[in-house]
């Protein structure tokens, strides 16, 4: 798939035509719900769940050079070749305890709400992001990250926990969503698909990306995760989409090159500290934000999700390594570890930039369907 060329920092609609055009209003799917494909290997559908995740294309990631144009979400084409119908992963996860309902998995029994009732909540994650429906909030300032450039020592624990690969972060990584909204990073993990099948958790206009990184943070108002679970703003996750690009991503290679060591479920290794911010997009000013939940049981709500508009590029080989190295429960490959997109149920996704405004020649007037609810606007 050929990616649209992107003008770094150009306003939406800055291009006159062709590939530089952002998504136009007429590009939106005609129905209320974005085009969907088959169920992913997420949990059993809940009643009324209209937002099932789709999956389409192959992955990609970005080298962080300022000169190079980097893909932005609003530049994605909305017309895509449908992927193969995705069946729930059926090669996986034989629960060792038989009917123990606490052993959740992707794609099959037990239904997640049986594992944790919160998974049937009304404000769950992930969701499909529709930029045209996002509310532009000028009050959403650029994210601030402090202390994310880690020295090689002490080393960090990289673990295959059977659901993902997780890097546990040391104390001292500070992140601010805005004034008085301060957090400490705890860990990061990834979600991915399989060969030829994308595996991001969030989608954009129904488009599923090859993979997604989540950096999980705890509000400084709380000392421990268990105190913060379910409390509004108690946890915050920074999420970025990973895509396929022409070059190897050196930051990600520091982790991906170690995956063979932790191929087995439950295994772990120690890796030198690295620049965690290098795993994220370089543009901290353009993002979408909404309140949702953890995307795995216990699915606790009140989580502030910040999804970067800019994507990160990895090479095809790196994306293959990510999706084809690790093993999960029951001698199954650890693949397609994403949850179905969940209904917004009235939530409005906010954008730090005018994602829904199309000022290109195709639109007679700018379109912005929702207004910002943030205080101070």
């Amino acid at each position: 798939q050929r990616l649209p060329r992107m003008q770094e920092d150009s306003p939406l609609g800055g291009g006159s035509s062709g590939e530089d055009d952002p998504l136009g209003e007429e590009d939106l799917p005609s129905e209320e719900d974005s085009p969907r494909e088959e169920d992913p290997p997420g949990e059993e559908d809940l009643p009324g769940e209209e937002d099932l995740p789709g999956e389409e294309d192959l992955p990609e990631v970005k080298p962080k050079s300022e000169e190079e144009g980097s893909l932005k979400l609003e530049d994605l084409p909305t017309v895509e070749a449908p992927g193969d119908p995705q069946e729930p992963q059926n090669n996986a996860h034989r629960d060792k305890e038989g009917d123990d309902q606490s052993h959740w998995r992707y794609g099959g029994d037990p239904p997640w709400p049986r594992v944790s009732p919160a998974c049937a909540g009304r404000f769950q994650s992930p969701v499909d992001i529709r930029p045209q429906l996002a509310a532009f909030c000028p009050a959403l300032r650029p994210l601030e990250l402090l202390g994310f450039q880690l020295p090689p020592l002490p080393e960090l624990r990289l673990r295959n926990n059977g659901h993902s690969v997780q890097l546990t972060l040391p104390p001292g990584l500070e992140m601010a969503l805005g004034p008085g909204r301060e957090y400490r990073a705890l860990q990061l993990h990834l979600h991915w698909g399989a060969a030829g099948r994308p595996g991001s958790e969030h989608t954009v206009e129904g488009h599923r990306f090859p993979a997604e990184i989540h950096v999980v943070h705890l509000s400084t108002a709380f000392a421990r995760v268990d105190e913060a679970l379910g409390r509004p703003g108690g946890l915050a996750v920074l999420a970025a989409f990973l895509e396929e690009g022409p070059e190897e991503n050196s930051a990600y290679e520091q982790l991906l090159s170690r995956l063979e060591e932790i191929a087995e479920e439950g295994s772990e290794t120690q890796v030198p500290g690295l620049d965690i911010s290098a795993l994220l997009p370089s543009d901290f000013s353009r993002y979408f934000q909404y309140e949702g939940s953890l995307t795995t049981p216990p699915c606790a709500q009140g989580v502030i999700w910040t999804v970067f508009n800019q994507t990160v590029m990895l090479s095809a080989k790196q994306l293959h390594t990510l999706s084809d190295t690790l093993w999960g429960p029951g001698d199954s490959r650890l693949q397609l570890n994403f949850r179905a997109t969940q209904p917004l149920n009235g939530r409005v996704i906010e954008a730090s930039f005018p994602a829904g405004v199309d000022s290109s020649p195709r639109a007679a007037e700018p379109v912005q369907l929702n207004s910002c609810l943030a205080a101070g606007d």
């Epitope: 996860h93 629960d95 060792k96 305890e97 123990d100 606490s102 052993h103 959740w104 998995r105 944790s116 673990r159 926990n161 059977g162 659901h163 997780q166 546990t168 705890l186 860990q187 999980v216 705890l218 421990r224 995760v225 268990d226 105190e227 679970l229 946890l235 479920e265 439950g266 795995t296 049981p297 216990p298 999960g328 429960p329």
Partner: nanobody
Framework: QVQLQESGGGLVQAGGSLRLSCAAS???????????VAWYRQAPGEQRELVAV???????KYSDSVKGRFTISRDNAKNTVLLQMNSLKPEDTAVYYC????????WGQGTQVTVSS
């Protein structure tokens, strides 16, 4: 207050057995069953060493030094993880720590295991 409490340590002769228990209490019971739980040990003057891990899905992993002798299991109904230690050797002598990883690490205070020859 979240707590992980280890118990079951003690003095045992080489070749004997012990069963360590890691129990969650307080708020941690809400997350313990979703955590990956590991037993680590630390002998005097040594680095902390991973002994055994059990994931939330029940998958297990052991260090080479205890494979075939130790067994880790979990009882989510009781919010406990057990470490059954058989054929104990003097080199198993250490303080054993329970670690629960759910978004962040929770640690117990440790329990002493001493294996005499």
């Amino acid at each position: 207050q979240v707590q992980l409490q280890e118990s079951g340590g003690g003095l045992v002769q080489a070749g004997g057995s012990l069963r360590l228990s890691c129990a969650a209490s307080g708020n941690s019971v809400n997350i313990f069953r979703f955590a990956t739980v590991a037993w680590y040990r630390q002998a005097p003057g040594e680095q902390r060493e991973l002994v055994a891990v059990i994931t939330s899905a029940g998958g297990t992993k052991y260090s080479d030094s205890v494979k075939g002798r130790f067994t880790i299991s979990r009882d989510n109904a009781k919010n406990t993880v057990l470490l059954q230690m058989n054929s104990l050797k003097p080199e198993d002598t250490a303080v054993y720590y329970c670690n629960a990883d759910f978004l962040q690490d929770y640690w117990g205070q440790g329990t002493q295991v001493t294996v005499s020859s």
